[in-house]
């Protein structure tokens, strides 16, 4: 399995962001496909579970990403992307996308570095 991501993503505080992760595989995509998304915070704290897909999508039942993430992928199109809603500044960090598609061997885990930035104020727009 080979994984492709946007590597770097900038999004405005309070908005939603699509974390894009696509993949290629020698094996056909079927019921064995799994996708796991995790998050490594900027402060070096423990990695956190974000999302899981296996036949159906599954949100985390606890923690900061509860009720804030949804599946936006399409396995038949080799897309394992997710949507993260209502971005907060402490969502800054690295999101990892891990795709397993047996019997293909696991590939390198894809990474996206998300930067959540301030909403552009009207005065700043006027100044620009």
């Amino acid at each position: 399995v080979e994984i492709y991501t946007s590597r770097v993503l900038e999004a405005v505080n309070g908005t939603d962001a699509r974390l894009k992760c696509t993949f290629s595989s020698f094996a056909p995509v079927g019921d064995a496909l799994t996708v796991t998304w995790n998050f490594r915070p900027l402060d070096g704290g423990p990695e956190q579970f974000v999302f899981y897909y296996h036949i159906d999508p599954f949100q985390p039942m606890s923690g900061r990403f509860k009720d804030r993430v949804s599946w936006d992928g399409n396995p038949e199109r080799y897309d394992a992307s997710i949507l993260l809603w209502k971005l907060q500044f402490d969502d800054n960090g690295t999101y990892t996308c891990q795709v397993k598609n047996p019997p293909d061997v696991d590939g390198v885990i894809g990474e996206i570095r998300l930067s959540v930035v301030h909403t552009v104020r009207f005065s700043e727009i006027h100044f620009l």
Partner: antibody, heavy 116, light 106 residues
Framework: QVQLVQSGSELKKPGASVKVSCKAS????????MHWVRQAPGQGLEWIGE????????DYNEGFTGRFVLSVDKSSSTAYLQISSLKAEDTAVYYC?????????WGQGTLVTVSS | DIQLTQSPSFLSASVGDRVTITCRAS?????MYWYQQKPGKAPKPLIY???NLASGVPSRFSGSGSGTEYTLTISSLQPEDFATYYC?????????FGQGTKLEIK
Amino acid sequence: QVQLVQSGSELKKPGASVKVSCKASGYTFTNYWMHWVRQAPGQGLEWIGEINPTNGGTDYNEGFTGRFVLSVDKSSSTAYLQISSLKAEDTAVYYCTIYTTALDYWGQGTLVTVSS
Amino acid sequence: DIQLTQSPSFLSASVGDRVTITCRASSSVGYMYWYQQKPGKAPKPLIYVTSNLASGVPSRFSGSGSGTEYTLTISSLQPEDFATYYCQQWSSNPPTFGQGTKLEIK
């Protein structure tokens, strides 16, 4: 490194109350929800509930509503489990644990013994 | 609540053996966690979301499954693996644990 340090063992009489503390260090306290798990002597694990340290929001297992109260003190990065109207069947080890990719980090456990 | 039933409840095995523990759910769950617990100690995570190894866990541990049936496999038992193992589901609230499987030295 992440550490969860719990208060010491307690011996209480039926009907009394107990407050178990769990002091967190090595991570940003408000970034991870705190969970409490009970293990009666020689028995399995039961989830009591969870608390969001950012806003104090709680979610309890149905069997633990009423007498069990979770709280946090953000200033000291400490979580608390208070049990009121103690019964003999509350005798157990109580663990605090944070949810990361699983319940990855656990306190050492606090034995609460309820006996007359 | 979803009930999890582990089998076997007790298991005797020798160092080097391949061991499989099964966890059956009363209704379909999306994924499973596995923990190891030694006497007097807190549980330690082994597997998260069905098949992912927790940090620092040796590769002889593996997890698989879907729906109502999940398995934990230890490919070659080591002396330090003798302990009690618990499965846990969290694709529906409240999270629930299996009753445990005690793995003993034969």
